[in-house]
């Protein structure tokens, strides 16, 4: 997601399952850090935002024609799992060690 | 990149290699369609934007706290190669059938 004038980076985002209505099936944890990708994808794109060729092209076009095309976007490029205690189909508390794709591991410009 | 009020989708983006300064080494084509991912990632995220769990969580948090976190971003999730005729290190015109990651194949919310 787009942010202020800082460059694309991973920042903390505490998520409470009750706030998003997932407390009806996730028993624990009550909250977790999902992290968020925040900041701009400015020219020149640094190696740490692991830009694709398309992101580089789009950044160059944006530089030349800012109104024609937007900048590349700072998004999660690698996600991590979390462990959850959830209610299975029968409502029984069940442990999933690796609930995939729930937390940002790395951000990049895409 | 974020767009108007339409939902996340692939749109045409004609790129002229001269405009981005790549004509110095790319002989042909003179231009190509890089495509662009444009539009918003609105709740509820449709299947066609192949949202990750993190994108779904972020969308739900944005819904509850719009000022705390941005929406997920519409970005390329799959890229395609193009064929180029380029000058190699010695300036010899060389054909590369698959110059990877140059064109958007699919967009999604991340």
């Amino acid at each position: 997601s787009t942010g202020a004038s800082s460059h694309c980076q991973k920042t903390s985002l505490r998520v409470n399952f009750e706030d998003i209505g997932w407390d009806s099936w996730i028993i624990a944890p009550k909250e977790y850090d999902a992290y968020e990708c925040k900041g701009g994808c400015f020219f020149p794109l640094a190696d740490d935002v692991t830009p694709t060729k398309h992101a580089i092209v789009q950044t160059l076009v944006h530089l030349k024609f800012p109104t024609k095309v937007g900048k590349a976007c700072c998004v999660p490029t690698k996600l991590s799992p979390i462990s959850i205690l959830y209610k299975d189909d029968m409502g029984v508390p069940t442990l999933k060690y690796h609930y995939e794709g729930m937390s940002v591991a790395e951000c990049g410009c895409r | 990149s974020t767009g108007a009020s339409s939902h996340c989708q692939k749109t045409s983006l004609r790129v002229n290699f001269e405009d981005i300064g790549w004509d110095s080494w790319i002989i042909a084509p003179k231009e190509y369609d890089a495509y662009e991912c444009k539009g918003g990632c609105f709740f509820p995220l449709a299947d066609d934007v192949t949202p990750t769990k993190h994108a779904i969580v972020q969308t739900l948090v944005h819904l509850k706290f719009p000022t705390k976190v941005g929406k997920a971003c519409c970005v390329p999730t799959k890229l395609s190669p193009i064929s180029i005729l380029y000058k190699d290190d010695m300036g010899v015109p060389t054909l590369k059938y698959h110059y990877e990651g140059m064109s958007v194949a699919e967009c999604g919310c991340r």
Epitope: I27, A28, P29, S83, L85, D88, D89, M90, G91, V92, P93, T94, L95, K96, Y97 | -
Partner: antibody
């Protein structure tokens, strides 16, 4: 082979509390829940509650809510059941039993209580 | 009173077949798996049948479980003296969010 070994018999006065322990050996403690089931003399089995040590999350039968506390110590692979405000009707054999909680195990088996501890007799008498 | 209903006692002669019934409701047996436990005199319960009709290793194939609607039953064929025990059915109750047991059935092997 997972084994559950419980603490010894207890004699308690009405109004007091009792804390029974259940030590697990073999297997991974964080892979399972420990449940407590009691059996009054000549009576059937009655589920009291259980705990998932990985998160320290406990849940209880309505009947015992507020009077029972189930805890677990992952470092020693031991679960505890504390029952307060004891009355004579609480005289029973208290069993701990394991239930696998990891969803990597087939649901049919995941919901079974297996194995059980040997039981702890708690006598409440003035 | 137990949530799941079992007959207090059943009996049979050695070699015979006996069945123990367990009746519940849509929120327990009707929508969840049924488990059977055997409790020999003076010992802790032991898992006998899991997931309606599965036997853990070491349990003889003389024991079998079945489920239909909101009822379940345990069948024991070729009855032996060592089968004399209390038998309990058990299921998760989705509505009450608790594990429920039957009142138990005492099996007596005659003769």
């Amino acid at each position: 082979q997972v084994q559950l070994v419980q603490s010894g018999a207890e004699v308690k006065k009405p109004g007091s509390s009792v804390k029974v322990s259940c030590k697990a050996s073999g297997g991974t403690f964080s892979d399972y829940a420990i449940h407590w089931v009691r059996q009054a003399p000549g009576q059937g089995l009655e589920w009291m509650g259980g705990i998932i040590p990985f998160f320290g999350t406990a849940y209880y039968a309505q009947k015992f809510q507020g009077r029972v506390t189930i805890t677990a110590d992952e470092s020693t692979s031991t679960a505890y059941m504390e029952l307060s405000s004891l009355r004579s009707e609480d005289t029973a054999v208290y069993y701990c039993a394991r239930r696998i909680v990891s969803d990597s195990v087939a649901v049919q088996y995941r919901h079974a209580f297996d194995p059980w501890g040997q039981g702890t007799l708690v006598t409440v008498s003035s | 009173q137990s949530v799941l209903t079992q007959p207090p006692s059943v009996s049979g002669a050695p070699g015979q077949r006996v069945t123990i019934s367990c009746s519940g409701s849509s929120s327990n047996i009707g929508s969840n798996y049924v488990y059977w436990y055997q409790q020999l005199p003076g010992t802790a319960p032991k898992l006998l049948i899991y997931g309606n009709n599965n036997r853990p290793s070491g349990v003889p194939d003389r024991f079998s479980g079945s489920k239909s609607g909101t009822s379940a039953s345990l069948a024991i064929t070729g009855l032996q003296a060592e089968d004399e025990a209390d038998y309990y059915c058990n299921a998760w109750d989705t509505k009450a969010y608790v594990w429920v047991f039957g009142g138990g059935t005492k099996l007596t092997v005659l003769g």
